[in-house]
């Protein structure tokens, strides 16, 4: 999906109002220095591409993020503010239901969410630069 035509201001507002709080809650008990940020992004559409990948694509050591509250809110905000995004999710949602897994917060998942926080902050910074 090409995130170029999204309403970035609206996505930023949703992130600041609610998604950020859920990410921070997920990370509670860990320090910001516990993990190194290894994933970056260069512009707003690129940041959203990376955020989508890290949030919804299961990895061998962290398969459960898509069911978290911050992930559900991320999916909702992308569906709302990115033209045509929802139709790309119809088959993806059905596939996700089939691979539902036991919810376990592993260290790898915490590391992945730490990367997500970094990507979202980068997204906000690139937005501020444009303004």
């Amino acid at each position: 999906y090409d995130f170029t035509n999204c309403d970035f201001q609206k996505i930023e507002a949703d992130y600041l109002r609610t998604i950020s709080k859920d990410l921070i809650t997920y990370m509670s008990g860990t320090k910001s220095t516990d993990f190194n940020n290894t994933v970056s992004c260069s512009n707003r559409p690129h940041c959203l591409t990376e955020i989508q990948s890290l949030t919804f694509n299961p990895t061998p050591r962290c398969a459960s993020l898509a069911k978290e509250m911050f992930a559900r809110k991320t999916k909702a905000t992308l569906a709302l503010w990115c033209p045509g995004y929802s139709e790309t999710q119809i088959n993806a949602t059905q596939a996700m239901k089939k691979r539902r897994k036991r919810k376990v917060t592993t260290n790898k998942c915490l590391e992945q969410v730490s990367q997500l926080l970094g990507l979202w902050r980068r997204f906000i910074r690139t937005l501020l630069k444009k303004q």
């Epitope: 949703d14 559900r72 999916k75 909702a76 569906a79 709302l80 045509g84 929802s86 119809i90």
Partner: antibody, heavy 120, light 107 residues
Framework: QVQLVQSGAEVKKPGASVKVSCKAS????????MHWVRQAPGQGLEWMGT????????DYNQNFKGRVTMTTDTSTSTAYMELRSLRSDDTAVYYC?????????????WGQGTLVTVSS | EIVLTQSPGTLSLSPGERATLSCRAS??????VHWYQQKPGQAPRLLIY???QSISGIPDRFSGSGSGTDFTLTISRLEPEDFAVYYC?????????FGQGTKVEIK
């Protein structure tokens, strides 16, 4: 089963406000946005706007900006649509309709409609 | 704002005939079109979503096709209960919009 039950018909004077409610049951309320659509007598469907409880956000049709407010009460699974500064051409049937925000993404269940008549 | 134009405005057909309803978008909207049926005094009812996806409980005589700007709702053999108004709707981008409707009436 999924049900959306709307409040009863209203008669209002021009310049007044109306608040229509829509009580949802049979599904997880926060998994869906609530949209509002109106239909003037003998006319087509007009999308008014939506409120998304999961994100605590709304979006309105520009035609109604400044006159409409959509809210929800998640504790009672009820959505509200308030329209202010009513005019005679606001006479219409007002529908609520749910739409999945993390799946389905379509208005698959509708309320029965609330007739609002604006007349002096 | 994406404008949807439905044609024809009215379709006069007999039971058993095939009905073909058209919906054209003012700009490409991929497959983000849904079709609703509305009978007098009733709320709209979802028939087809995302251009061609069928809904459980909807008779299979209803089918949808199209992508981009041109979409079609087909009723293979009209039953007496199918005479109603049909609306297309886009959810590609906000504000969501509806076509003006096609009335399918008994000839």
């Amino acid at each position: 089963q999924v049900q959306l039950v709307q409040s009863g018909a209203e008669v209002k004077k021009p310049g007044a406000s109306v608040k229509v409610s829509c009580k949802a049951s049979g599904y997880i309320f926060t998994d869906y946005a609530m949209h509002w659509v109106r239909q003037a007598p003998g006319q087509g469907l007009e999308w008014m706007g939506t409120f998304i409880p999961l994100l605590d956000t709304s979006d309105y049709n520009q035609n109604f900006k400044g006159r409409v407010t959509m809210t929800t009460d998640t504790s009672t699974s009820t959505a509200y649509m308030e329209l202010r500064s009513l005019r005679s051409d606001d006479t219409a049937v007002y529908y609520c309709a749910r739409m999945g925000v993390t799946h389905s993404y379509v208005m698959d269940a509708w309320g029965q409609g609330t007739l609002v008549t604006v007349s002096s | 704002e994406i404008v949807l134009t439905q044609s024809p405005g009215t379709l006069s057909l007999s039971p058993g005939e095939r009905a073909t309803l058209s919906c054209r978008a003012s700009q490409p909207i991929s497959i983000s079109v849904h079709w609703y049926q509305q009978k007098p005094g009733q709320a709209p009812r979802l028939l087809i979503y995302f251009a061609s996806q069928s809904i459980s409980g909807i008779p299979d005589r209803f089918s949808g096709s199209g992508s981009g700007t041109d979409f079609t709702l087909t009723i293979s053999r009209l039953e007496p209960e199918d005479f109603a108004v049909y609306y297309c709707q886009q959810t590609f981008s906000l504000p969501y919009t509806f076509g003006q409707g096609t009335k399918v009436e008994i000839k």
